[in-house]
Amino acid sequence: PKQTLPKPIIRAESTYMVPKEKQATLCCQGSYGAVEYQLHFEGSLFAVERPKPPERINGVKFHIPDMNSRKAGRYSCIYRVGELWSERSDLLDLVVTEMYDTPTLSVHPGPEVTSGEKVTFYCRLDTATSMFLLLKEGRSRDVQRSYGKVQAEFPMGPVTTAHRGSYRCFGSYNNYAWSFPSEPVKLLVTGDIENTSLAPTDPTFPDSWDTCLLTRETGLQKDLALWDHTAQN
């Protein structure tokens, strides 16, 4: 039978959108007993980390200093136990922000609407970009894209209280290099009386799931247990 190790999970600590010149931190969560973790960028080896002691830690953090457009792109990680390597993690898109200019975000008919009304966001940026992105704070994985020379529109259709929250937009110079964020626009949706006061507020940036859930084993676990779970040929 085939020897396999669980595929690692790659995450960005706090957010995958990193302002230029700031430090990005990526976490690779593998297994206790893993000897070495490798971070790959666009398919090539980028960094290596070794947890110390390996049998007590289930992952590592990779710090990427001085974020810029050359470091923005697709990252993945792998790890090994003994000389056996895991499969590659899923890909993580790391974006550099605060490039060049700041767009302006507006909403029509206005920031205060009634449930069922049609709402459209407009993102405007005068410098050369053709792609615009709209993000709801706390939901930054759900990026809406739209295209336009100077301005893009984001029709939301009939809104509900679920659309309430703060929105920002970005101009994108390529998939991984974004402008400064616009000033936030807070959309207030009234109606659906039973939900109005009880609807949970969205978490603000950073995203609640963009955290590194690495743990250090403190109990008396069998030393290097993982060596044995993959021992067959």
Epitope: V35, K52, G82, E83, L84, W85, L224, T230
Partner: antibody, heavy 117, light 107 residues
Framework: QVQLVQSGAEVKKPGASVKVSCKAS????????MHWVRQAPGQGLEWIGY????????EYNQKFKDRTTITADKSTSTAYMELSSLRSEDTAVYYC??????????WGQGTLVTVSS | DIQMTQSPSSLSASVGDRVTITCRAS??????LAWFQQKPGKAPKLLVY???NLADGVPSRFSGSGSGTDYTLTISSLQPEDFATYYC?????????FGGGTKVEIK
């Protein structure tokens, strides 16, 4: 059962290249790394590098990096180690070794490469 | 690079003797150490992995111990087939390196 069968002995002149093959059987070739280790006559063991046949990713001992190429052919479950610009001190037995969660668990029978003018 | 210093380089012993071979790493290798046995004209054979775990089919008279930088291979009662050369090897980083070897000879 797991078997690593290497190509036969080679005699080469200084400056030439040699390519040693290692055919794997008895396991899933792409699930394990393949390492290369050499041993000069009467000497100890020296790690050259490895390949992950699944991805083609290679890592080398810095000492050999400029002269060594490790490749793998998934269709034939065969790994190769090519060493160029041969010198007399490259005379050694070259082993392919399977890398598993337990380390270097299966070794080929070895290939003697003699470099002599 | 991590250096692996093995001692002694050779030893003479009799059948039934207890034999101890040591290996010191130049830095902490966190138990990422293996021991191999090699007989003349043959490929090395894995004896111990992860410092303390016996490989399949290895007699229980062999044992590995140690942590950090210092590791030991012990043969509790030497048998005729144990006369060979023994190597330690780390796999904590790149390059993987081996100790210089210990030749166990018949007294």
């Amino acid at each position: 059962q797991v078997q690593l069968v290497q190509s036969g002995a080679e005699v080469k002149k200084p400056g030439a290249s040699v390519k040693v093959s290692c055919k794997a059987s008895g396991y899933t070739f792409t699930s394990f790394t393949m390492h290369w280790v050499r041993q000069a006559p009467g000497q100890g063991l020296e790690w050259i590098g490895y390949i992950n046949p699944s991805s083609g990713y290679t890592e080398y001992n810095q000492k050999f990096k400029d002269r060594t190429t490790i490749t793998a052919d998934k269709s034939t479950s065969t790994a190769y180690m090519e060493l160029s610009s041969l010198r007399s001190e490259d005379t050694a037995v070259y082993y392919c070794v399977r890398g598993s969660s337990r380390g270097f668990d299966y070794w080929g029978q070895g290939t003697l490469v003699t470099v002599s003018s | 690079d991590i250096q692996m210093t093995q001692s002694p380089s050779s030893l003479s012993a009799s059948v039934g003797d207890r034999v101890t071979i040591t290996c010191r790493a130049s830095e902490n290798i966190y138990s990422n150490l293996a021991w191999f046995q090699q007989k003349p004209g043959k490929a090395p054979k894995l004896l111990v992995y992860a410092a303390t775990n016996l490989a399949d089919g290895v007699p229980s008279r062999f044992s590995g111990s140690g942590s950090g930088t210092d590791y030991t291979l012990t043969i509790s009662s030497l048998q005729p087939e144990d006369f060979a050369t023994y190597y330690c090897q780390h796999f904590w980083g790149t390059p993987r390196t081996f100790g210089g070897g210990t030749k166990v000879e018949i007294k």
